[in-house]
């Protein structure tokens, strides 16, 4: 079982849509997904959680964070739409 | 909403060519891998081939009974897809759809509505 | 590449009747499998996804059931709507994502 995260680091400008690609490689129909972030201060943060059924975010996704559960890709992308100064961080994928 | 259009179908002759279109919008086209499907009364619905996303190098894959004849390619600035058909055979006749697979949290499957080809003398 | 081997070809059925058709792949797919209905000059219509999961405003009486390489899918009390013709897909693994042969379900 492995995760792959094939967007590069990025630099977007604020107020624009950004899409974190991740897909993962397992023979079990309905895993369950996350994406986490560390932000400058190193803070740890949960950001989103999904299986093939349901998707639930920290509530600050609220409104501009979503997740597109591709299941014929196997693809759990990350949306951030509209992008603030504040989602500045290192995102990890996992399951 | 999201929409798939295709278009560029019509009557050829066998051995000819022909360039489908589809057109999508209302999603994040550049995310999801498209796909080709055709239709004919005698085979029923036939997946034709597919086409990944910039980070899978535009890998294309295709069915055995179109493999060297026909080219998917898509253009995510343009939001379309497009199926280059050469050698065409009277076999090849029939509805060609583009479809992709949504996000499970969405709709699973979207279709377009379909374009005629005809290849006939 | 995997083959869908889809049954019966073809059914006639009475409105009121609970109708079967099944799906085996010539291996696992892992549940990997949708359904489609369609209607004569309409795009195919999805009813279920992954084996088991309704598509969104498909009605109860349809259900997808199986697993590895063996799947049906089950419309009870068939209503006249429900005539057309039915395809299962595999999206397991490397393409090509094959479908059955199609069952056409007519009125008795």
């Known amino acids: 079982d492995k995760v792959t995260q094939s967007s590069p680091d990025q630099t977007v400008a604020s107020g624009s849509e950004v899409v974190l690609l991740c897909t993962y490689d397992t023979v079990y129909s309905n895993p369950d997904l996350f994406w986490y972030r560390i932000r400058p201060d190193y803070s740890f943060q949960f950001v989103f959680y999904g299986d093939n059924s349901r998707s639930e975010g920290a509530d600050f996704t609220q409104g501009r964070f979503s997740v597109k559960h591709i299941l014929t890709q196997k693809a759990f992308h990350l949306v951030i739409s509209p992008v603030r100064t504040e989602d500045s961080a290192t995102y990890y994928c996992a399951f | 909403e999201e929409k798939l259009e295709e278009s560029g179908g019509g009557l050829v002759q066998p051995g000819g060519s022909m360039k489908l279109s589809c057109v999508a919008s209302g999603f994040i086209f550049s995310i999801y891998w498209m796909n080709w499907v055709r239709q004919s009364p005698e085979k029923g619905l036939e997946w034709v081939g597919q086409i990944r996303l910039k980070s899978d190098n535009y890998a294309t894959h295709y069915a055995e009974s179109v493999k060297g004849r026909f080219t998917i390619s898509r253009d995510d600035s343009k939001s379309s897809v497009y199926l280059q058909m050469n050698n065409l055979r009277a076999e090849d006749t029939g509805i060609y759809y583009c479809?992709?697979?949504?996000?499970?949290?969405?709709?699973?499957?979207?279709w377009g509505q379909g374009t005629l080809v005809t290849v006939s003398a | 590449d995997i083959q869908m081997i889809q049954s019966p070809a073809s059914l006639s059925v009475s409105v009121g009747e609970t109708v079967t058709i099944t799906c085996r792949a010539s291996e696992n797919i892992y549940s990997n499998l949708a359904w489609y209905q369609q209607k004569q000059g309409k795009s195919p219509q999805l009813l279920v996804y992954?084996?088991?999961k309704l598509a969104d405003g498909v009605p109860s009486r349809f259900s997808g059931s199986g697993s590895g390489t063996q799947y049906s899918l089950k419309i009870n009390s068939l209503q006249s709507e429900d005539f057309g013709s039915y395809y299962c897909?595999?999206?397991?693994?490397?393409?090509?994502?094959?479908f059955g042969g199609g069952t056409k379900l007519e009125i008795k």
């Open positions: 479809m992709y697979y949504g996000s499970s949290y969405e709709r699973f499957a979207y």
């Open positions: 897909q595999h999206f397991w693994g490397t393409p090509p994502w094959t």
């Open positions: 992954v084996a088991t």
